[in-house]
Amino acid sequence: AFGISGVQKYTRALHDSSITGISPITEYLASLSTYNDQSITFALEDESYEIYVEDLKKDEKKDKVLLSYYESQHPSNESGDGVDGKMLMVTLSPTKDFWLHANNKEHSVELHKCEKPLPDQAFFVLHNMHSNCVSFECKTDPGVFIGVKDNHLALIKVDSSENLCTENILFKLSET
């Protein structure tokens, strides 16, 4: 996990809110865990950050992620008249200047240092999945979600016409 004291004191002050020229609706500092209660952790290795999915020891502190919420028109805008509604989108930042990115070519989720405006690869459509869970769909690749594969985060294609268990794309957000 990050050994950066600033992470736990993460506030809006660390982020100017001009991402893609829009201000977030709100921001939320939370720990991220899987449906099976494994923690998402971030480690600095060889000057780059790695993302892990692991069981924490009893009193080990969970890493926090700053979620910035945005509203966005549905990309397909199927109706053509805006009635399709606005989606909630998020960016996820575990430490200053670093954001989760979707690498669609490698089907991987990576932490990139980047400047504003953030690229579309840093934005995820937030899905409500009952049982206090959410899912993160790539803005750049509809139908592709952040998921867990081999104790790492990966991009997973979800076919809504398939009847499959989606537990590996379910995440819990917690303030503790």
């Epitope: 939320y28 549905h74 009635v83 899905h127 016409s161 398939e162 989606t166 957000l173």
Partner: antibody
């Protein structure tokens, strides 16, 4: 044009059954959670039932007052959602709206015009 | 269940003035750092129409005259300046927990 059209309402006796249908058009039906909401002068707007997507195993949720009596289902090939209502009571009288949640499933943003159900002897 | 109490049950506002409708929840409707409180407008013979979602975000195509605020248990819908066409019933609704619940409604008349 995004549209929801309910049918199947009418007059039914207490204890009777009725099946409501709602046909959707103008959007990819299989991508959206669907709901039934009813409205009566006595109880106002009441959420009744919800059905999720195929990849959520079509999980369903119900208001306590209709659990065990009402059943929501969908047929994605027909872009239709149904509400099977059994053991109907006088208090089930009202306008029944079919409603679609937004993409991402945070709020209802498309409603049908409604169909009226009257439970009376 | 989360109970939503709206006030007032009816109000009459002069054209061009401000209308404020309150909605109080029996417990917090906050989750994931957001407030899952929506506002709907309903005119006679029509289904409800979404105005505001997650407490303060405007629905698609909703005029800027409509704004929402609040968090936790206390919320309000503001309409300013009110227009003739705003005569309607207004409902708050929570989408945090099942069963999703609605407020009892507020009838707005324009003087």
């Amino acid at each position: 044009e995004v549209k929801l059209e309910e049918s199947g309402g009418g007059l039914v006796q207490p204890g009777g059954s009725m099946k409501l249908s709602c046909v959707a058009s103008g959007f990819t039906f299989s991508n959206y959670w669907m709901n039934w909401v009813r409205q009566s002068p006595e109880k106002g707007l009441e959420w009744m039932a919800e059905i999720t997507l195929k990849f959520n195993n079509y999980s369903t949720h119900y208001a306590e007052s209709v659990k065990g009596r009402f059943s929501i289902s969908r047929d994605d090939s027909k872009s239709t959602v149904y509400l099977q209502m059994n053991n109907l009571r006088a208090e089930d009288t009202g306008i029944y709206y079919c409603a679609r949640r937004n993409y991402g499933d945070w709020y209802i943003n498309v409603w049908g015009a409604g169909t009226t159900v009257t439970v009376s002897s | 269940d989360i109970v939503l109490t709206q006030s007032p049950t009816s109000l009459a506002v002069s054209l061009g003035q401000r209308a404020t409708i309150s909605c109080r929840a029996s417990e917090s409707v906050d989750k994931f750092g957001m407030s899952f409180l929506n506002w709907f407008q309903q005119k006679p013979g029509q289904p409800p129409k979404l105005l505001i979602f997650v407490a303060s975000s405007q629905g698609s195509g909703v005029p800027a005259r409509f704004s929402g605020s609040g968090s936790g248990t206390d919320f309000s819908l503001n309409i300013h300046p009110v227009e003739e066409d705003d005569t309607a019933m207004y409902f708050c609704q929570q989408s945090k927990d099942i069963p999703y619940t609605f407020g009892g409604g507020t009838k707005l008349e324009i003087k």
